[in-house]
C-alpha cells in the first residue's frame, strides 16, 4: 500500500522538516526559516510559535518541531501547551478579578496559584487543633480531646486504633 501511495502521490515521500513544493514539480523542499513540519507528506510548513512578552522559550523551534514556551518568573502556565500565563500570587493569597487578595480568615493557600481553601475542621474527625491555621498553612489536627489525659503530652501520637473485640497483644 505504501508503494502504491507513493506512486500516486509523490508528496508522501517528503519527510518531516520538508514540504512538497507545488511550484517546483512537487520536489521536497526544506521548511523555510521559522517554520516546521512535524510529519511527512505535508504541502506546507507551519509557522513556528513565537515566545514573546511574558512567554519565554523553553525549546527552540526546529525544522521538525514547534517551539515550546513557558512563563517568565512571576507567572505560571495555563492551558494546553502553555497557551496562557497567569500571574502568581504570594502564599496566603488568591487571584481575584481585582488581582491578588489575602485569604479570608479561616482559609489558606500554601501555593503561588490556586484558590484559598478552608482550614481542616479537626472536630469532624473527633480531633483537636494541635497547631492553629494561618493564611499560608492549614491547621494541624492532633489527638481527640478525650485522648489527652491530664499530664499527657499533646504531641504524643495517638495509639493505633484497634478493631472492636481485639485484645491487646
Amino acid at each position: 500500500f505504501e508503494r502504491t501511495r507513493s506512486l500516486q502521490d509523490p508528496c508522501s515521500n517528503c519527510p518531516a522538516g520538508t514540504f512538497c513544493d507545488n511550484n517546483r514539480n512537487q520536489i521536497c523542499s526544506p521548511c523555510p526559516p521559522n517554520s516546521f513540519s512535524s510529519a511527512g507528506g505535508q504541502r506546507t510548513c507551519d509557522i513556528c510559535r513565537q515566545c514573546k512578552g511574558v512567554f519565554r522559550t523553553r525549546k527552540e523551534c526546529s525544522s521538525t518541531s514547534n517551539a515550546e514556551c513557558d512563563c517568565t518568573p512571576g507567572f505560571h502556565c495555563l492551558g494546553a501547551g502553555c497557551s496562557m500565563c497567569e500571574q502568581d500570587c504570594k502564599q496566603g493569597q488568591e487571584l481575584t478579578k481585582k488581582g491578588c487578595k489575602d485569604c479570608c480568615f479561616g482559609t489558606f493557600n500554601d501555593q503561588k496559584r490556586g484558590i484559598c481553601r478552608p482550614w481542616t475542621n479537626c472536630s469532624l474527625d473527633g480531633k483537636s487543633v494541635l497547631v492553629n491555621g494561618t493564611k499560608e498553612r492549614d491547621v494541624v489536627c492532633g489527638p481527640s480531646p478525650a485522648d489527652l489525659s491530664p499530664g499527657a503530652s499533646s504531641v504524643t501520637p495517638p495509639a493505633p486504633a484497634r478493631e472492636p473485640g481485639h485484645s491487646p497483644q
Partner: nanobody, 121 residues
C-alpha cells in the same frame, strides 16, 4: 496595523526620575490592560506594573512599590510609567504589552519593542 511604541527611556542619575510612555494604535485601546515589563542584561524578564482597562493598577514587582506609578490617557491611547527615585538595579529595557486582563497573558497579546533605561550611580 497593531502597534505598541515605547518612548521616554534614557540615561539618568540614581535618585532621578523618568516617565515612560506606551502609545497604542490599531486596536480598541479602552478594552485592553497595559502591562510594563523589563529585562536587564543577563537576567530574566520581569513584570513591573500593569493598569487595567478600568484604571486599576497591579504591581508585579514589590521592588518598585512607592517609586513607580502607572496611569492611562484613553483619549491619547497612551499609558505612562512614572519612575522616581531610580536605582542602578532599575537599569533594563522596558517594554509594554497589551493583555485583556492584568492577571492573564496569551500568545495573541500585542507587545512593543522596548525602550532602554540606564541608571548610573
Amino acid at each position: 496595523q497593531v502597534q505598541l511604541q515605547e518612548s521616554g527611556g534614557g540615561l539618568v542619575q540614581a535618585g532621578g526620575s523618568l516617565r515612560l510612555s506606551c502609545a497604542a494604535s490599531g486596536f480598541t485601546f479602552d478594552d485592553y490592560a497595559i502591562g510594563w515589563f523589563r529585562q536587564a542584561p543577563g537576567k530574566e524578564r520581569e513584570g513591573v506594573l500593569c493598569i487595567s482597562s478600568s484604571g486599576g493598577s497591579t504591581y508585579y514587582a514589590d521592588s518598585v512599590k512607592g517609586r513607580f506609578t502607572i496611569s492611562r490617557d484613553n483619549a491619547k491611547n497612551t499609558v505612562y510609567l512614572q519612575m522616581t527615585n531610580l536605582k542602578p538595579e532599575d537599569t533594563a529595557v522596558y517594554l509594554c504589552g497589551a493583555p485583556r486582563d492584568c492577571s492573564y497573558y496569551t500568545s495573541d497579546d500585542y507587545w512593543g519593542q522596548g525602550t532602554q533605561v540606564t541608571v548610573s550611580s
